[in-house]
């Protein structure tokens, strides 16, 4: 057949539904390949066509879209499944063309189960909560476009395996689900079941997603360097090793990116000739405020060296600070036998 | 179409044991809870408790616990529930019932196997 | 473990009528309630889920409300084929427990 544009496997886009349960997939041609939409694309005469690879083999195959009760079905760019069972598992290729147009793109699908618990393989949206900052919501996501505004589905949460009902401080309210005060003990799993009716059926969409308390922009601070500071002095001899940590705080801000780094002499230490080494560790509290600490090394310092300013720098959204490091050459202890000498009037 | 199919009535004598099985069709037997529920000749219904086949998970009800024992096979989508040292409380019919979905209503049941406990 | 009540273990009524039936909960059960027909021939069927919503093929003449710990179940015009025992059944916690049963007859 004429030649085809084609994007691949669309590997980015990774579909994860349930075993049992209906899911509708967008044809990914129309959101991240293409500049024009479904509707443009119909009336200007081009169709649709989807097929698929079954998992573990090679051959392209057309979707079967005469099964009972329509369990797989397309409208418009996307692909229903009215439930998905475990062998849909694949990678399905939506191709748009006519007689002088084609382009394609496959995805993977992958259909999982879930336990008891609703644990599974799935990847979990993570929501961050700031603590004790309030009333906020979670909402059930990405059950859009699976039934009108006109049907009122029944909607159950849970809080790992447990209903969600006479918590303290957490509150289902429909598609929402309320924290009156977040604290550390809301850290989990949220599960979100939506059951609804169509054509005579009942279908379940089970949405689970990670919820993560974190700092209060109320309490967030400027980043706070606690090493270097004026209590410590790095007082080393020519030849000896140089090890000096810049350990800072930073706040939990969302989206912020922190930094660390040193200058010496005001540069950069990749911009200068010395042999220094920089290595960072990072680690987190439970609200996910950040310690980062870089130890700046040399190894065998020279008296030129211990005469240069080393600052630690920290930035974040909250602001910029800096701090010197103060280093000295250690004065040699005095030789006994001279001292003595000097001090008898010895010649 | 959603089946749950069981196993025949069982006449058996007092401190015996019988299994019963429920056989389901057109739906992911792994990813819902199964029920086991009782009804005495006469009397309501009683749940037993239930077992999810994807992980082996089961919950019972107190007095059932060491009475019954739920247990589930992927391969052939069958639920099956033993009833261990039966007595004349014993006799029953037994029904299973599949919850749709996660939600603790019981959508779709069996027809019922009648377990007859007689010396 | 939570009991649930039926008071009314029969209840009698004339074709087309209004029929109520009650079920009580020993604690508030947050409208996690279901009400289930069993016919004379042994078969059950789910009628409404979660107090109010009615399951996919069961006749508009059902319905259901409560809150708390009282619920019940209406049916708006009695039919001949509505001649059954009617169970509640809380979810709320487990164990999953039902009513005792009102088994309904035609006068």
């Known amino acids: 057949s004429e030649r085809c544009d084609d994007w691949g496997l669309d590997t980015m886009r990774q579909i994860q539904v349930f075993e049992d349960e209906p899911a509708r997939i967008k044809c990914p041609l129309f959101e991240h390949f293409l500049k024009f939409n479904y509707s443009t694309a119909h009336s200007a005469g081009l169709t649709l066509i989807w097929y698929w690879t079954r998992q573990d083999r090679d051959l392209e195959e057309p979707i079967n879209f005469r099964l009972p009760e329509n369990r797989i079905s397309k409208e418009k760019d996307v692909l229903w499944f009215r439930p998905t069972l475990l062998n849909d598992t694949g990678n399905y290729t939506c191709m748009l063309r006519n007689t002088t147009y084609c382009s394609k793109v496959a995805f993977p699908l992958e259909v999982v189960q879930k336990d008891s618990c609703f644990n599974s393989p799935m990847k979990l949206p993570v929501h961050k909560l700031y603590i004790e900052y309030g009333i906020q919501r979670i909402t059930c996501p990405n059950v859009d476009g699976y039934f009108p505004s006109s049907v009122k589905p029944t909607i159950t949460w849970y809080m790992g395996c447990y209903k969600i009902q006479n918590f303290n401080n957490v509150i289902p309210e429909g598609m929402n689900l309320s924290f009156l005060i977040a604290l550390i003990s809301n850290n989990g799993n949220y599960t979100c079941v939506v059951t609804y009716p169509e054509n005579g059926r009942t279908f379940h969409l089970t949405r689970t997603l990670t919820v993560k308390v974190v700092g209060s922009p109320k309490n967030a601070v400027p980043p706070v360097i606690h090493s270097p500071n004026d209590h410590v002095v790095y007082e080393k001899e020519p030849g000896e090793e140089l090890l000096i940590p810049c350990t800072v705080y930073f706040s939990f801000l969302m989206d912020s990116r922190n930094e660390v780094w040193w200058t010496i002499d005001g540069k950069k230490p990749d911009d200068i000739t010395i042999d220094v080494t920089i290595n960072e560790s990072i680690s987190h509290s439970r609200t996910e405020d950040e310690t980062r600490t870089q130890i700046l090394s040399i190894k065998k310092v020279t008296s030129e060296d211990l005469k240069r300013s080393y600052v630690c720098h920290a930035r974040s959204a909250k602001g910029e600070v800096a701090k010197a490091a103060k280093v000295k050459q250690k004065v040699p202890a005095p030789r006994y036998t001279v001292e003595l000498a000097c001090g008898f009037g010895a010649t | 179409q959603v089946q749950l199919q069981q196993s025949g009535p069982e006449l058996v004598k007092p401190g015996a044991s019988v299994k019963i099985s429920c056989k389901a069709s057109g739906y992911g037997f792994s990813s819902s809870w199964m029920n086991w529920v009782k009804q005495r000749p006469g009397k309501g219904l009683e749940w037993i408790g239930r077992?999810?086949?994807?992980?082996?998970?089961?919950n019972y009800y107190g007095e059932f616990k060491g009475k019954a024992t739920l247990t589930a096979d992927k391969s052939s989508s069958t639920a099956y529930m033993q009833l261990n040292s039966l007595t004349s409380e014993d006799s029953a019919v037994y029904f299973c019932?599949?919850?749709?979905?996660?939600?603790?209503?019981?959508?779709?049941w069996g027809q019922g196997t009648l377990v007859t406990v007689s010396a | 473990d939570i009991q649930m009540t039926q008071t009314t273990s029969s209840l009698s009524a004339s074709l087309g009528d209004r029929v109520t039936i009650s079920c009580s909960a020993s604690?508030?059960?947050?409208?996690?309630l279901n009400w289930y027909q069993q016919k004379p021939d042994g078969s059950v069927k789910l009628l409404i889920y979660?107090?109010?919503t009615l399951h996919s093929g069961v006749p508009s003449r059902f319905s259901g409300s409560g809150s708390g710990t009282d619920y019940s179940l209406t049916i708006s015009n009695l039919e001949p084929e509505d001649i059954a025992t009617y169970y509640c059944?809380?979810?709320?916690?487990?164990?999953?427990?039902f009513g005792g049963g009102t088994k309904l007859e035609i006068k």
């Open positions: 604690q508030g059960i947050s409208n996690y």
């Open positions: 979660y107090t109010s």
């Open positions: 059944q809380q979810y709320s916690y487990l164990p999953w427990t």
């Open positions: 019932a599949r919850n749709d979905g996660y939600p603790a209503w019981f959508t779709y």
């Open positions: 077992i999810y086949p994807g992980d082996g998970n089961t």
